[in-house]
Structure formats: structure tokens, C-alpha cells
């Protein structure tokens, strides 16, 4: 099975225990790291962070060690936009120009391939997006021929079923890409005004509709009916949390809510914990397991979070063999208990070490 | 099928310049690059250089670096090899090439001998 | 002076197995996929052997290919006749972003 695991280069300025850089990963705990994100200037492919090079080189120092780790780069993201992305894929030259930068750029640096993180297509770019996808990949063939190792390509799919719709010809774009990570997290947010587990693994009793989309096992199985293979398709599961403020004394799923929850001290997102601000929350917090979703969820206070535990990882798992699936994907490295000294465990990355061994289990 | 048919054999002198061509037919020109390979009289092969037909971007070896201009014209499927400042060393075979993994083409060769 | 080495010359007799060899660097064979070719007198090359150790179609089972760190080997077994030619090894170097051959073997089948 793959495990497929993302780094953000700007974990690097968290303060204090909360900083990470690649250094600090663990070569022998996936088979793919994803760097994030680089960007694109002036139709190449570039990088984002001032020391993004010097990053690199430390990433890719870790296959010294392990020459079987792949590390691919992520260009794109949340912070790129769509709308850049859209006029590079639109326009014939630009989009010629950006796909011929890219092998060269990722050799220089010593990635194994490029992921591709357009955050979200939209219905009139579904069409660019296939070609970007295709004409990529015809390109890695053809900078391959001469003996090279073929650079891989995959790209990060969105697991909400109206975003597929509308941006993914899944079918054609699963023929082109190495394997497809799809963000089956982020399901719930503040704007849902009620509590709600942000990765549940099934769609809880709760759930009235739209909810019925909005769970891990209805987004895979729809990626599967709309023609991805089993075999390329990377099952995400998140090691961060979504929090909210609770508006009542309710706290149940479903409650009524003010707004996102407190930032972490470290991560210092409104909404968002990582798993290890997580371990330091449920010191007093109360645990619930929403039982027909499979995730935990804590209260403290006003607080509320769902998050994703090393059972509930365990769970995905399984889930995700039973479907004969490629493997799992972690969004992020950063997020998890890097350093092993915030969860109690003496265990680096404890929720990315469950997903290995559960992985490795027979 | 597949064919990389070159242009005929050339008796040129020293200083000269020859160009040889390299149609093809029977696949998609801007699939593969295209690469130049020469064999001298009882030698080896040498790679000279490879061209992109999608966008005409080259790679040259640093031996014919400044002597050589590989170029392909999509109109026609055709690749070219020019090879400038012609000297008695440079008397071969030229062949036309998509080189390493299948499909692994091959023209048939040209003939070029640099005599005074 | 090529960048990959192979030996000038090897030979052996009808039916017996031979291998030639072809020593490069972490740059060329360390990093990337090798191929091998055949070259029958008068004739172009034709790959045998790719991505170390595959066959295209239409190449007899009798041809095979290896690698270990900066060095490759192709094997022949059952030396026909036929046989009789020229072997490259051949790969991209990655340090001078071009592709580099061997100095060719001259195979001669005994008898």
C-alpha cells in the first residue's frame, strides 16, 4: 500500500515545539512525501518560500537513507487560487510553457514527481484540467524516453460530491495519473452553524441531507462509480482537527455554534487544531465517539472538536483495504505529533505510525 | 508502420556544411524526441544531440557543441541535422533515432564523407 | 573516451553464454535506466534490452539485462551465429543532461 504524506513548508514558522522542518520527518515512515506548495511565476513552475531550495535539499536528503521514499511537489494550493491556475490551463501557450518547466525544475531539486494541487476547478476549467493532466503526463513520457526514471503526476481531488461534479472528468483524468489523493476531510465547517465531525468515515444517523455526501465512504464510492480505479485511488485522512465555539450549553453533534473554535497556540487558525494541540486539549476534555461515523470527538468548555485518533485512523484503514484501495494519504507530517513529546506515547508521529502499521497488517 | 526515411548520401569538403533530414511517418512526430547519432568508419556510436519537435528545444552533446543545429518542422514530420565546419573526422553514418525505450526508431542512415 | 566502459571484445562458442559488461557512475547508470543495443554489420542499431532489464517484443528470452549500482550486464545464452555483431550499452547522464553509449563490444561466436 502507498502512504502518501504531505509537508507545508510554512509549518516551518510555527513557533517554538510547533516548527518543523524536513529534517525532522522520518524517512522510513511513508512511501510518498509531498512537499507543499510551490508556486508558478510567469508560466514556471517556482518556488514559494524564500528558502524553499535549501528545503528541498533537505527533504530529498532523506532518500540517501531510504532509496525506495519517493518525494514528489505539490504546486498549487489553498493560498495560489484558483483563478491563476485557471488562466494557465486555458491558454494553450501558457499551459505549454508551465508543463515544459516543470520536468526540469523537479530534477534539479531531486523530486520523484509533481502533485497537483488546483484548489478547486471550476465547471468551465474541468475541461483545461483534464488537458493540463494529459498533456502533463505526455510530457513526462517523453522526457522519460531517453532512460530517465519517469516523473510521477498526481493531483489532489476535493471529496465533496458538488466540487466533483463540477471540476472532475474523473473517468479521463484517473487514465493519466500515477494516483489520486483524494480530501476525504473538511466535510463540516463553521458554516454549517451546528457541531459536526469534519472526516467522518460513514454518514452518521444524525445526518439529514446534503449530509448523506458528506462522509469519507460516499465520497470514495463515488469516485469509484465515476470511474477512478481502486488502484490509484489515496484515501485521506487528516491528523488535524476542525473545532467550533459551542453557542449553548448543548454539546452534542449538531449543536448550535457561535463561530469556529480558538486557535491552537501553535497553529493559531481559528477552526483548526493539530493533532498534537489536540493531545493538549483532551488533558480535562471529554471524549465521545460518534459511533456510526467511527471519529472521536472532545468538549472542553465551549470547545468542540473532531478529530481523528489512532482508532478511528485503524478504522479508515480497514475501510479502505476492504475497498482494495491504493493506500492512504496524511495531510500533514506537521500536523501529527512530529516530535513525539505532546501525546504521551515516547512515538514520533503516532497517528501517521497507526496508518503505517495498519497498513503493513495482515 | 513506422518509418524514418533520411535523406540520401553527400560528398562534401572540408569547411562545408551538410544537412541531412529525417522524415517520419507512421506515428505522432511530437511524441518522441528526436536524436542524432554518428558512426564513424569501424568506430562506435556517439550521440550528437536531440530535438523536441513539439517546440524545437535542443540538447547537444558538448563534443559537436557550436557545430551542430538539430531542428524539426512539424508542418512536414520531418527532423533535420545540419553539422557545420565540416572536417575529415566528421566522414560517417548519421542516423536518426528515438532513442531508449520503445518505440525505439531508427532511420536508415546517411552517408556523409568529408573528402578534399 | 566513452563515458560508460565496455570491454572491446568477447567471444565464445556456439550454444555457450557470454556477458559483456558496462561500468559507468552514479550520474548515468546509478541513476537511470539502461538499454542495450545489437548493431549487425552494415545495419542500425536495435534495442534489445531496456530499462535494465526488459525486452521489447519480438527480442528472444535467450537476451537479458542486469544492474548493480553504477555497472550493467547484458547476458546472452544459447550463442547463435546470428549473434555475431556489435553490443552498446547506453543511458542519459544526468550531471551532463545528455544521453551517453558505450564503446561497443565486438561479439564473435567461436566455430
Known amino acids: 500500500y502507498k502512504l502518501v504524506c504531505y509537508y507545508t513548508s510554512w509549518s516551518q514558522y510555527r513557533e517554538g515545539d510547533g516548527s518543523c522542518f524536513p529534517d525532522a520527518l522520518d524517512r522510513f515512515l511513508c512511501t510518498h512525501i509531498i512537499y507543499s506548495f510551490a508556486n508558478i511565476s510567469n508560466d514556471h513552475i517556482d518556488t514559494w518560500e524564500w528558502n524553499d531550495v535549501t528545503l528541498y535539499g533537505m527533504l530529498n536528503t532523506l532518500k540517501n537513507r531510504n532509496p525506495n521514499l519517493k518525494t514528489l511537489l505539490s504546486v498549487g494550493g489553498w493560498n495560489f487560487g484558483s483563478q491563476r491556475f485557471s488562466k494557465i490551463a486555458s491558454n494553450t501557450q501558457s499551459r505549454r510553457t508551465f508543463i515544459k518547466s516543470v520536468p526540469p525544475f523537479l530534477r534539479t531539486h531531486g523530486f520523484d514527481g509533481l502533485d497537483l494541487a488546483w484548489l478547486y476547478p471550476g465547471r468551465r476549467d474541468k475541461q483545461h484540467f483534464t488537458t493540463l493532466i494529459k498533456e502533463m503526463k505526455a510530457e513526462f513520457i517523453k522526457e522519460a524516453q531517453p532512460g530517465k526514471k519517469q516523473l510521477l503526476l498526481s493531483a489532489a481531488l476535493s471529496a465533496g460530491k458538488v466540487t466533483i461534479d463540477s471540476s472532475y472528468d474523473i473517468a479521463k483524468i484517473s487514465q493519466h495519473l500515477d494516483f489520486i489523493s483524494i480530501m476525504t476531510y473538511d466535510f463540516h465547517g463553521a458554516w454549517r452553524g451546528t457541531t459536526g465531525h469534519h472526516s467522518p468515515l460513514f454518514r452518521g444517523q444524525e445526518d439529514a441531507s446534503p449530509d448523506r455526501f458528506s462522509n469519507t465512504d460516499y465520497a470514495v464510492g463515488y469516485m469509484l462509480r465515476l470511474g477512478a480505479p481502486a488502484s490509484k485511488l489515496v484515501m485521506g485522512i487528516p491528523t488535524f482537527g476542525r473545532s467550533f465555539t459551542l453557542a449553548s450549553s448543548e454539546t452534542g453533534v449538531g449543536a448550535p455554534i457561535s463561530g469556529p473554535g480558538i486557535p491552537g497556540r501553535f497553529t493559531k487558525e481559528a477552526g483548526t487544531l493539530a493533532y498534537y494541540e489536540i493531545c493538549d486539549f483532551l488533558r480535562g476534555a471529554t471524549v465521545h465517539r460518534i459511533l456510526g461515523q467511527q471519529v472521536p470527538y472532545a468538549t472542553k468548555g465551549n470547545q468542540w472538536v473532531g478529530y481523528d485518533d489512532q482508532e478511528s485512523v485503524k478504522s479508515k484503514v480497514q475501510y479502505l483495504k476492504d475497498r482494495q484501495l491504493a493506500g492512504a494519504m496524511v495531510w500533514a507530517l506537521d500536523l501529527d505529533d512530529f516530535q513525539g513529546s505532546f501525546c504521551g506515547q515516547d512515538l514520533r508521529f503516532p497517528l501517521t505510525n497507526a496508518i503505517k502499521d495498519a497498513l503493513a497488517a495482515t | 508502420e513506422v518509418q524514418l526515411v533520411q535523406s540520401g548520401a553527400e560528398v562534401k569538403k572540408p569547411g562545408a556544411t551538410v544537412k541531412i533530414s529525417c522524415k517520419v511517418s507512421?506515428?505522432?512526430?511530437?511524441?518522441?524526441?528526436m536524436h542524432w547519432v554518428q558512426q564513424a568508419p569501424g568506430k562506435g556510436l556517439e550521440w550528437m544531440g536531440l530535438?523536441?519537435?513539439?517546440?524545437?528545444?535542443?540538447i547537444y552533446a558538448e563534443k559537436f557543441q557550436g557545430r551542430v543545429t538539430i531542428t524539426a518542422d512539424t508542418s512536414t514530420d520531418t527532423a533535420y541535422m545540419e553539422l557545420s565546419s565540416l572536417r575529415s573526422e566528421d566522414t560517417a553514418v548519421y542516423y536518426c533515432?528515438?532513442?531508449?525505450?520503445?518505440?525505439?526508431?531508427w532511420g536508415q542512415g546517411t552517408t556523409v564523407t568529408v573528402s578534399s | 573516451q566513452s563515458v560508460l566502459t565496455q570491454p572491446p571484445s568477447v567471444s565464445a562458442a556456439p550454444g555457450q553464454k557470454v556477458t559483456i559488461s558496462c561500468s559507468g557512475s552514479?550520474?548515468?547508470?546509478?541513476?537511470?535506466?539502461v538499454s542495450w543495443y545489437q548493431q549487425l554489420p552494415g545495419t542500425a542499431p536495435k534495442l534489445l534490452i531496456y530499462?535494465?532489464?526488459k525486452r521489447p517484443s519480438g527480442i528472444p528470452d535467450r537476451f537479458s539485462g542486469s544492474k548493480s549500482g553504477t555497472s550493467a550486464t547484458l547476458g546472452i545464452t544459447g550463442l547463435q551465429t546470428g549473434d555475431e555483431a556489435d553490443y552498446y550499452c547506453g543511458t542519459w547522464d544526468s550531471s551532463l543532461s545528455v544521453w551517453v553509449f558505450g564503446g561497443g563490444t565486438k561479439l564473435t561466436v567461436l566455430g
Open positions: 533515432a528515438t532513442i531508449g525505450r520503445p518505440p525505439d526508431y
Open positions: 507512421g506515428y505522432t512526430f511530437t511524441d518522441y524526441y
Open positions: 530535438v523536441d519537435p513539439e517546440d524545437g528545444e535542443t
Open positions: 530499462d535494465n532489464n
Open positions: 552514479s550520474s548515468n547508470i546509478g541513476n537511470n535506466y
